[in-house]
């Protein structure tokens, strides 16, 4: 679709003559008829296939024709066409004399031909005017012409339609050849696909306008490359969406079981030692002088038996007082007035004199202690067994009976069931009191993650045309992420090209 434009510039008919040789009376009141048609080697009568137009009276005999953009007598003359410009044409320009109406001479009776010219040739679409001058014996015509495309038509034959737009159907301007030039931030054949934020993850992110990066379910962050843990997860993270991989010290499916109660809650009071023992489990080992589950109760000052050599202890508000038996003195009845001659050592202890006979010392046999070997040794009084182990006196020695999950002379070593890597298929292992517990990734179950869940929706390959399958928050749901050119919940439909342009 385009316009053939003809600019009439000057017409000369100095003698004011008609084509039949007679003069015009009183002068030749001149108008023009233009016929544009397809190329003919020999111009013939017949319809003006590319269009025709007439002018009002433009002057008398000889005159210059000025450009005029509105009203009657527009110059250049416009001959619009709504087909592909073939590049060739035939043009017939006739000058006529009218005795009648200036504005509509075409309809007046008695019009007479002054002269005519015929040109045939080729003409490319373009903005440049082609100038020409035709002379015959009586007249001279100076003119120029060109072919330009109508608005929104482009190309060397004005056949390519392109209308710039910035809406849901596209965001582009038109190049001189009619091709689309996408506005900044848009791409695609019709410039209808936004260019997402630089670095936005190809599968996990998408955008509906330029420089956005909206994340698909299960992903977060500026570039949608960080996963979101399961919505029931409490103290865990993820490496894939909806996972719940427990932070250190937490266990269970949703990482809500406290495996490090001692650190998280500090339940043991008065400087006592806390030992973890399974989910929410712990043991407090009290310092001397304290008792209770959390060592929160203070024992009486006499509870530690501070009086030696059979002295009896009396509690005061903030202290105690030892009443010594005959022959002993000192704060704890630790000093004796006896000598070895008094046979003070019991249970087979042997006596040694000290300080020139002023005192003595007992050397006790195994299993006995005290100044006079009067006490049987209790090797468990120092609470030597860690992590809730039970202390047992065994003659001259003692042993620790450890709780499940602990070993070592003093139950100080934690047996890690997880060291054997019992969890299959990438499961996360947690040491619990009753053995290891595996947190399984999506698609697997069982105590050791050894069972593949057959109803993992992605296992059946439900997505077509090379789409990527993601399980949703649960294994029986899936999402297909379609490659470019496909749509549908399973990416089963190709995107059909629109039957016609949507403008």
């Amino acid at each position: 679709s385009g316009i053939f434009q003809l600019r009439l510039q000057e017409f000369a008919n100095e003698r004011g003559m008609l084509a039949n040789g007679r003069p015009c009376e009183p002068g030749c009141r001149t108008f023009f008829r233009i016929c544009l048609k397809h190329y003919q080697a020999t111009f013939s009568e017949g319809p003006c296939t590319f269009g025709n137009v007439s002018t009002p009276v433009l002057g008398t005999n000889s005159f210059v024709i000025r450009d005029k953009n509105s009203g009657s007598g527009r110059n250049p003359l416009q001959l619009p066409f709504n087909f592909t410009w073939p590049g060739t044409f035939s043009l017939n320009i006739q000058a006529w004399h009218t005795p009648g109406d200036d504005l509509r001479p075409e309809t007046s009776p008695g019009n007479s031909l002054i002269s005519q010219i015929i040109i045939q040739g080729s003409l490319a679409v373009g903005k440049n005017w082609k100038s020409d001058e035709q002379n015959n014996t009586l007249t001279r015509l100076r003119y120029s012409y060109r072919v330009v495309c109508s608005d929104n038509y482009y190309g060397d034959s004005c056949s390519r339609l392109c209308k710039k737009r910035d809406d849901h159907f596209g965001h582009y301007e038109c190049q001189p050849d009619g091709s689309l030039s996408c506005l900044p931030g848009w791409t695609g054949k019709y410039c209808d696909q936004p260019i997402c934020l630089s670095g936005c993850h190809e599968q996990n992110g998408y955008c509906s306008k330029p420089d956005e990066c909206n994340c698909r379910p299960g992903w977060q962050g500026p570039l949608c490359n960080e996963c979101i843990p399961h919505n029931g997860c409490r103290h865990g993270t993820c490496t894939i969406p909806w996972q719940c991989a427990c932070d250190e010290g937490w266990g269970g499916l949703f990482c809500d079981q406290d495996l490090n109660y001692c650190t998280h809650h500090s339940p043991c009071k008065n400087g006592s030692t806390c030992s973890n023992s399974g989910p929410r489990g712990y043991t407090c080992t009290c310092l001397p002088g304290y008792t209770g589950e959390h060592c929160e109760l203070e024992l009486s000052k006499c509870a530690s038996n501070p009086c030696r050599n059979g002295g009896s202890c009396k509690d005061h508000e903030n202290s105690y007082h030892c009443l010594c038996p005959p022959g002993y003195y000192g704060q704890h009845c630790e000093h004796s007035t006896l000598t070895c001659a008094d046979s003070p050592c019991f249970n087979g202890g042997s006596c040694r004199e000290r300080n020139q006979g002023a005192s003595y010392a007992c050397e006790c046999p195994p299993n006995f202690t005290g100044s006079n070997c009067e006490k049987k040794v209790d090797r468990c009084t120092s609470n030597p067994c860690a992590n809730g182990g039970q202390c047992l006196n065994r003659g001259p020695s003692r042993t620790c009976r450890c709780r499940p999950g602990f070993t070592g002379t003093h139950c100080e070593l934690h047996i890690s069931d997880c060291a054997r890597s019992p969890c299959a298929h990438g499961g996360t292992c947690h040491d619990l009191e009753n053995g290891p517990v595996c947190t399984c990734p999506a698609g697997f179950s069982g105590r050791r993650c050894e069972v593949r869940i057959t109803n993992d929706a992605c296992a059946s390959g439900p997505c077509f045309n090379g789409a990527t399958c993601y399980t949703g928050l649960s294994p029986n749901n899936f999402v297909c992420n379609c490659p470019y050119g496909f749509v549908g919940s399973r990416c089963e439909f190709p995107v059909g090209l629109p039957p016609s342009f949507p403008w």
């Epitope: 379910p217 992903w219 977060q220 500026p222 960080e226 103290h235 865990g236 949703g472």
Partner: antibody, heavy 118, light 107 residues
């Protein structure tokens, strides 16, 4: 037990500002994305803003874009909503929630009422 | 933005009744749909996520179904504590959007 406790609501004049806070406990706050959702009196729920867990990437709803900002302090287990240029239509109960704009909102606070009126 | 339309907007039922609430999305949201329960003066509570998964601590009388654009919340045998307003929400497309709510009242 997961707990979210909002504070900072109240009466404010149009054009004024307010800062809402949300104190979180019972879960590892820094591991999870957080959001604000609001509910105008007698109306339905409307998502306002979300923030990612580690890099604090904020996403703001169109109705409040340019006026509200969401932020978090993982060391203090706290989520914030700075509201500027308040309008009458911002009057609502504002809920702090654990979740992102593309995930379910798993846990909610009790809400704090913001009234914008002259 | 995706429009979420719930029906009915209000509903009267009796204890023991089976109740169904529907939610329609203006375009395909796959299975990325959640249901919430809200009682007067209280915060919403997550009931169901991913169309049919029960949230932690939610009774088994609640169930969800559907995919694509049409979804359903079913309460198999209504209990006195179930009278509340129910909202659906899609989280497939940005921004997340909620339905207008369905108020469940005692008959």
């Amino acid at each position: 037990e997961v707990q979210l406790v909002e504070s900072g609501g109240g009466l404010v004049q149009p054009g004024g500002s307010l800062r809402l806070s949300c104190a979180a406990s019972g879960f590892t706050f820094g591991n999870f994305p957080m959001s604000w959702v609001r509910q105008a009196p007698g109306k339905g729920l409307e998502w306002v803003a979300s923030i990612s867990s580690s890099d604090s990437w904020a996403t703001i709803g169109d109705s409040v874009k340019g006026r509200f900002t969401i932020s978090r302090d993982n060391a203090k287990n706290s989520l914030y909503l700075q509201m500027n240029s308040l309008r009458a239509e911002d009057t609502a109960v504002y809920y702090c929630s654990r979740g992102y704009y593309n995930s379910p909102f798993a846990y909610w606070g009790q809400g704090t009422l913001v009234t914008v009126s002259s | 933005d995706i429009q979420m339309t719930q029906s009915p907007s209000s509903l009267s039922a009796s204890v023991g009744d089976r109740v169904t609430i529907t939610c329609r999305a203006s375009e395909d949201i796959y299975s990325n749909l959640a249901w919430y329960q809200q009682k007067p003066g209280k915060a919403p509570k997550l009931l169901i996520y991913d169309t049919n998964n029960l949230a932690d601590g939610v009774p088994s009388r609640f169930s969800g179904s559907g995919s694509g654009t049409d979804f359903t919340l079913t309460i198999s045998s209504l209990q006195p504590e179930d009278f509340a307003t129910y909202y659906c929400q899609q989280y497939n497309n940005y921004p997340p959007t909620f339905g207008q709510g369905t108020k469940l009242e005692i008959k």
